[in-house]
């Protein structure tokens, strides 16, 4: 592990041998002030106590400033997703500086000495700052540091050692390995800053977990439940990339969230809204699409300060690439059945038809079991905007599609000979839309005829009878 | 699948120097690194050093940092160490393997190199 | 550099024991130790990584434990197959380092 020494920290890797034997002397930690979109161009080193680089590359004092910080690299140089999000910030604050924190000797090394580096990192980060509050007009509140994966723990231990309270930490998807159940000064924490956002999009409960489960932010978003991203698995990075293997499904999931924040940035009009919840599966539910008492956020650069909240988990689903915001529904169906239907879980899906456009012919996902004689709720979501919901349709996938339904088909029959039809009675749906928070009630067209049977579909209409529309809409909503 | 090939054994003389070869298939090559294990008779696994293809990086135990040269060659897809001033010391199994990052584990093994050095 | 610790080199066991193998550190390694099978042709395979996580593909009578400088591979039900080398190695930092490895055969 290379041991930084020298004022500005400098490294000497010993066991790294290059072709021709040669000790090579880098910086460990620089500040690059990014003065162009560019990423070819130099931009501008910034170094403590000394003052000519900030006039000569005309930092602004009295703007916003970000300092990217990026996580472990095996490469040893920059990721695409740097100067992406450099230039997604530059077409959004046009007056702001950008920093990029190279700190890429420390963290081109095995993991877990790039962890152990990260404290001495931050610590650099730390002087700078504490530097740069001695400029007159330097504001800390206006500095938000961004660190993705090793990154955002580099960023809590900035804001940990700086002298004051940093405007906001951004985390992008905060490391796992070595953090996971960390006391809060050895990892990023709602204390690091005014204000900590995180965005979780590699977690998991097997193998591995590259991300960090655990909230660690004032808020801690968990887009599509923090795990399988859409547009990631094998097949889609097959697709891709000669050879996919299970390293682009990692690097992609985890790196989703860095693209989820530079969506937030460039796609202004299309935010993207989570909703807090306890956990995955209560989301997965469709039971909390509530913005009532700040239960909603945008997500990314636009997220609302929540000071008050500390590890609130918040949930949204996403698609598979940018723009990423889809429109979230709650469907809640009473459902009765006269006719038992056994121990196979229907298969129903739902087309939505608004003003604007139809859905797509969506699955209800059951992600425990069907409660018959109860009100259920469903989560279902679309790519586009539909605009306000004029009928629904539902319908009730045929029989036997796998050998599982085909057996407990056959063994329903068995258990139930002179009653074998399956069929539910649904008279109304309850729709409430989690981005307009708008709720409307629909019912069958005709009472008489609300049975629904396998292979079957019920067609619904916005009640008659003084259907309900609360138009309450969400403090987040038409932001642009 | 993932594939490392191992070149054939060698029988060399004290003093001279050899190169084994670890051709990787069923994976993007310059995503990985290769590291290097030695192996002698009946004995235990000891660390030699890593290769990673994406961007040149070496690494090397202290101890073989004398002893061994890591290269690769891109368009074929092969890691190759090079042992050099050659003793019976060195005679020995060398494996090569595949890093999985983050885990820092050898996820997947050549079938091994047996080198004998005898006059 | 880490020294890694088998203290038994070779065990003997019958056909569906249940054996576990042990590995000490000489300081914390936070998680990051692996277990390796040797087999008698020389083949080597990666069992468990990160103290317990099951490599793809291994059948689920291994398991992993520990935490800190002690830790321990367990076969629940030894099978045939089983019979080889087992080596645990370290990967908290370089030199990687393994340990001696225990020998298992059937009794």
């Known amino acids: 592990s290379p041991v930084p020494f020298g004022p500005e920290g400098r490294l000497e890797d010993k066991l790294h041998k290059p072709k021709a034997t040669q000790t090579e002397v880098k910086p460990s930690v620089r500040f690059n002030l990014r003065t162009s979109k560019d990423p070819e161009h130099e931009g501008c080193y910034l170094s403590v106590g000394h003052s000519q680089p900030l006039e000569d590359c005309s930092f602004n004092m009295t703007a916003k400033t970000f300092f990217i910080i990026h996580g472990w690299t095996m490469s040893g140089i920059f990721e695409n997703w740097l100067h992406k999000l450099v230039s997604a910030l530059h077409t959004r604050e046009k007056d702001a500086n950008v920093v990029v924190v190279d700190w890429l000797p420390l963290a081109h090394q095995l993991y877990t000495d790039a962890v152990n580096n990260t404290r001495v990192v931050g610590h650099s980060i730390a002087r700078m700052l504490d530097w740069l509050q001695e400029k007159d007009d330097f504001s800390l509140g206006n500095v938000h540091l961004i660190g993705y994966s090793l990154g955002a723990h580099v960023a809590g231990y900035a804001g940990n050692f700086v002298k004051g309270t940093v405007g906001r930490i951004t985390g992008l998807d905060p490391a796992g390995p070595m953090f996971e159940g960390a006391d809060i000064h050895k990892r990023l924490s709602p204390d690091d800053a005014d204000f900590v956002d995180v965005l979780h999009t590699y977690t998991r409960s097997f193998g591995l977990s590259i991300g960090i489960q655990m909230p660690v932010g004032h808020i801690d978003i968990y887009p599509n439940g923090g795990d399988f991203q859409p547009g990631c698995g094998l097949n889609d990075v097959l697709g891709s990339i000669a050879y996919g293997t299970i390293t682009e499904v990692v690097k992609c999931e985890h790196e989703r969230a860095v693209h989820l924040f530079v969506d937030s940035l460039v796609n202004q009009d299309k935010p993207s809204f989570a909703f807090q919840c306890t956990d995955s599966n209560r989301f997965k539910k469709g039971i909390c699409l509530s913005c009532r008492k700040n239960r909603c956020n945008n997500i990314g650069y636009n997220a609302k300060k929540m000071r008050k909240k500390r590890n609130s988990k918040m949930y949204l689903k996403t698609r598979a690439g940018m723009p990423f915001k889809v429109y979230h529904y709650q469907l809640k169906v009473h459902m009765f059945s006269y006719n038992n239907s056994g121990d196979t879980q229907p298969t129903l899906y739902i087309t939505l038809y608004g003003s604007n456009a139809d859905s797509q012919n969506l699955p209800l996902e059951i992600v425990e079991k069907i409660e018959l004689n109860a009100t259920n709720t469903f989560l279902v979501y679309t790519e586009e905007d539909l605009g306000d919901l004029l009928k629904m349709r539902l319908t009730w996938e045929g029989v036997a599609h796998s050998w599982y339904n085909l057996w407990n088909e056959f063994r329903n029959y068995l258990s139930q000979p002179s009653n074998p039809s399956r069929e539910l009675y649904i008279r109304r749906i309850r729709v409430k839309s989690g981005e307009t928070q708008r709720k409307v009630t629909f019912c069958t067209q005709d009472p008489t005829k609300s049975s629904i049977s396998p292979g079957q579909e019920l067609w619904f209409h916005k009640c008659q009878d003084g259907w309900k529309m609360k138009n309450k809409t969400s403090p987040f909503v038409n932001l642009a | 699948q993932v594939q490392l090939q191992q070149s054939g054994a060698e029988l060399v003389k004290p003093g001279a120097s050899v190169r084994l070869s670890c051709k990787a298939s069923?994976?993007?090559?310059?995503?990985?690194?290769i590291h290097w294990v030695k192996q002698r008779s009946g004995q235990g696994l000891e660390w030699i050093g890593w290769?990673?293809?994406?961007?040149?990086?070496?690494k090397y135990n202290e101890k073989f940092k004398d002893k061994a040269t890591l290269t690769a060659d891109k368009s074929s897809r092969t890691v190759y160490m090079e042992l050099s001033r050659l003793t019976s010391e060195d005679s020995a199994v060398y494996f090569c393997?595949?890093?999985?990052?983050?885990?820092?584990?050898?996820?997947?093994w050549g079938q091994g190199t047996l080198v004998t050095v005898s006059a | 550099d880490i020294q890694m610790t088998q203290t038994t080199s070779s065990l003997s066991a019958s056909l569906g024991d249940r054996v576990t193998i042990s590995c000490r550190a000489s300081?914390?390694?936070?998680?990051?130790l692996n277990w390796y099978q040797q087999q008698p042709d020389g083949t080597v395979k990666l069992l468990i990584y990160?103290?317990?996580r099951l490599h793809s593909g291994v059948p689920s009578r291994f398991s992993g434990s520990g935490s800190g400088t002690d830790y321990s591979l367990t076969i629940s039900n030894l099978e045939q197959e089983d019979i080889a080398t087992y080596f645990c190695?370290?990967?908290?930092?370089?030199?990687?380092?393994f340990g001696g490895g225990t020998n298992l055969e059937i009794k």
């Open positions: 393997a595949r890093h999985e990052e983050y885990t820092n584990s050898l996820a997947y």
């Open positions: 069923g994976y993007t090559f310059t995503k990985y690194t």
């Open positions: 290769f990673y293809p994406g961007s040149d990086s070496i």
């Open positions: 300081q914390d390694i936070s998680n990051y």
């Open positions: 990160y103290t317990s």
């Open positions: 190695q370290q990967g908290y930092t370089l030199p990687w380092t």
